[in-house]
């Protein structure tokens, strides 16, 4: 039985050229996290954090994605094309798979706010 919940940073905005932290947190379960996959809106993988082998950044993002903090991901040198949905997928044992959603809006404006509050989707 899957008892856990994924908390995410929800809807966030950040400046073009800046950076943003994508963060998910799995709570209310004792399940072991074997791997966390980070995907972009077009389902392309940005990064994988494997419990045994560590972080793996996909080639297309290796110059502007930094692992962490924790199981989160830092996306740097933001462009307008980065606007969209991001998904964290927690593969756990024995529960199975948990998935969280974050919506990132990249703004031209220099007064873009970076919201860091956590939400339960």
């Amino acid at each position: 039985m899957m008892t856990g919940t994924i908390e995410t940073t929800g809807n966030i905005s950040a400046k073009k050229g800046g950076s943003v932290i994508l963060q998910c947190h799995l709570s209310s379960t004792m399940a072991q996290v074997t791997q966390v996959n980070w995907e972009q809106h077009d389902h392309s993988l940005l990064a994988i954090r494997n419990a045994e082998l560590g972080w793996h950044i996909y080639p297309a993002f290796k110059d502007r994605v930094a692992p962490g903090p924790g199981l989160g991901l830092t996306l740097q040198s933001l462009t307008m094309n980065d606007t969209g949905e991001y998904f964290c997928t927690y593969h756990t044992y024995p529960d199975g798979t948990y998935r969280g959603r974050i919506f990132l809006e990249v703004l031209e404006s220099s007064v873009a706010e970076h919201s860091a509050r956590f939400q339960i989707p």
Epitope: E52, L53, H56, Y58, P59
Partner: antibody, heavy 123, light 109 residues
Amino acid sequence: QLQLQESGPGLVKPSETLSLTCTVSGGSIASGSYYWGWIRQPPGKGLEWIGSIYYSGQTYYNPSLKSRVTISVDTSKNQFSLKLSSVTAADTAVYYCARDGVLTLNKRSFDIWGQGTMVTVSS
Amino acid sequence: EIVLTQSPGTLSLSPGERATLSCRASQSVSSSYLAWYQQKPGQAPRLLIYGASSRATGIPDRFSGSGSGTDFTLTISRLEPEDFAVYYCQQHTVRPPLTFGGGTKVEIK
């Protein structure tokens, strides 16, 4: 479709270093989803995993061979290589390269293999 | 390391018969990490089953895998002439390191 091809000397002298290269064709070694591994099989015996590498150079090795093994990758040539030092007759085997799905979780396996190359250690 | 013990070492059967191959692990293995391979003389191994029970692409449905924990089974429901070969199980953990079983030879009776 994706193909792997091993190459290297078929004969190596005892105490020297065995060097093999695996060339990947029909796909990129830098796909991001896979490691790339080496497995060997002594004549008439079973399979032994040696180690695997990610496109970025991250590796994991069989502890029993780790002190003698170096695996490297060259993404510009779509190749990865194996070096095994201080070889003895016990290292005589068919050496295979294969795609390692360790990051695919429920599909963890070696799903695509090269045809293998025989390496004999003898003076 | 996790030792995989395959039995029997050799299985002598006739075409059309059912083959049941066993793979026993020295400690519990996640079924997600258990694979089976077929190897014919002079050829590289070919992936048959991953995740203990999922058939790899292009593998006929006469091959099936089952099991969990420490006991896994590969079943060939009806042996075809091309199925006579050596079969290996493999567990794909990182720590302890991944290992192969010693193999089961399926030969023509």
